[in-house]
């Protein structure tokens, strides 16, 4: 039995693979900020994590997913203040009683250091120094992703 | 200057109603979740209510759940408990205190400012 | 009867280091919950003085120290002044609300 959030990124992901390819994204839409390989958006408003999840959908994009503690790092260096907490991808998955990304993937134990209990209906959050289980339904801010894939220049055969 | 000064303790008989108000000041107070915590005399703090700074959200100590509602007016920056069927155990300070973390209650939070106290009194 | 414990009250001479303990369990301290702590000196409001287990706000000074590990936490005081007596809570979060421990009273000898 999956839990509302459950269903809701599983949906969200299977429509999104439904869509046809985009061009890959060269540079980073107006207010994104890049990272690497990729742009963020920081909210300004403030949703619960399930409503953050489709915020970001619509957006074409996902809910930030952190692929080790350096990538966790370089993320809150651009969180300005530490009193502000921001959703990422991150939630309890009560079925395999284990965090899951929702890319589908589990959290490797050694890549963050969680601060709260993992239980039913608690999703995961940042700060400027931390990363914290809280309740799903807590208002707060998000981090939406966009991944850039720079396209490779054709080579055409001489005609 | 962060300030919190509340008001509207007193005397009141068992069973009465009483509301609180505290005024706040030097900052953003629609930003921040606010809460009430409470002191009996010559007891410990204990956490009694909690509201998200747009108000849409409350939490509230099993203690006063049905009993006391938590509000607040961002136009007048003021945070309110109404406090109703109230008891001699519900004598104690009332302290208004600001939530570290912005928005909403945090399960994390701390409160950073706390007002004076105003003292609520239930006795016949 | 609160979810978290402190000693009633500790003791030291001006200079020493003294420290005070937060005892909880698996709901609370245990489930990673960050642990916060408060001076309230006589006739006052609490002050926040610890928070999120070591941090600590601008203005306390650091003879102010606080740590966590496992189920329990605590608040180290050293180089004990006079101005330092007063009542000491420790605050974490359990089955869904803020609580605190029962206080601990600090005098300095």
């Known amino acids: 039995q999956k839990s509302s959030i459950e269903k809701c990124s599983v949906d969200i992901q299977q429509s999104r693979n439904k869509t046809t390819e985009r061009p890959g994204l060269l540079n980073c839409p107006i207010y994104w900020q890049q990272l690497r390989e990729k742009c963020l958006l920081f909210s300004h408003t403030v949703n619960p994590w399930n409503n953050s999840l489709a915020d970001c959908s619509t957006k074409e994009s996902s809910l930030l997913l952190i692929r080790d503690k350096d990538e966790l790092i370089h993320t809150q260096n651009l969180i300005r203040d530490k009193a502000i907490l921001f959703w990422i991808g991150l939630n309890f998955s009560l079925s395999e009683k284990n965090w899951k990304w929702i890319n589908g993937s589990f959290l490797n134990s050694n890549d963050l250091e969680i601060r709260g209990d993992a239980k039913e209906n608690s999703c995961i959050s940042i700060s400027q120094t931390s990363v914290y289980s809280e309740y799903c339904s807590t208002e707060i801010r998000w981090i939406c992703q966009k991944e850039l894939t720079p396209v490779r220049n054709k080579v055409y055969p001489d005609s | 200057e962060v300030q919190l000064v509340e008001s509207g303790g007193g005397l009141v008989q068992p069973g009465g109603s009483l509301r609180l108000s505290c005024a706040a000041s030097?900052?953003?107070?629609?930003?921040?979740?606010m809460s009430w915590v409470r002191q009996a005399p010559g007891k410990g703090l204990e956490w009694v209510s909690a509201?998200?700074?747009?108000?849409?959200?409350?939490y509230y100590a099993d203690s006063v759940k049905g009993r006391f509602t938590i509000s607040r007016d961002n136009s007048k920056n003021t945070l309110y408990l109404q406090m109703n069927s109230l008891r001699a155990e519900d004598t104690a300070v009332y302290y208004c205190?600001?939530?570290?973390?912005?928005?909403?209650?945090?399960?994390?939070?701390?409160?950073?400012?706390w007002g004076q106290g105003t003292l609520v009194t239930v006795s016949s | 009867q609160s979810v978290l414990t402190q000693p009633p009250s500790v003791s030291g001479a001006p200079g020493q280091r003294v420290t005070i303990s937060c005892t909880g369990g698996?709901?609370?301290?245990?489930?990673?919950?960050?642990v916060h702590w408060y001076q309230q000196l006589p006739g006052t409001a609490p002050k926040l003085l610890i928070y999120?287990?070591?941090d600590r706000p601008s203005g306390v000074p650091d003879r102010f120290s606080g740590s966590k590990s496992g189920t329990s936490a605590s608040l180290a005081i050293t180089g004990l002044q006079a101005e330092d007596e007063a009542d000491y809570y420790c605050?974490?979060?359990?089955?869904?609300?803020?609580?605190f421990g029962g206080g601990t009273q600090l005098t300095v000898l």
């Open positions: 205190a600001r939530d570290y973390y912005l928005y909403d209650y945090i399960t994390q939070t701390s409160f950073d400012y």
């Open positions: 030097g900052f953003t107070f629609s930003s921040y979740a």
């Open positions: 509201i998200s700074g747009s108000g849409g959200s409350t």
């Open positions: 698996s709901s609370n301290i245990g489930a990673g919950y960050d």
């Open positions: 999120g287990n070591s």
């Open positions: 605050q974490s979060y359990d089955s869904g609300h803020t609580v």
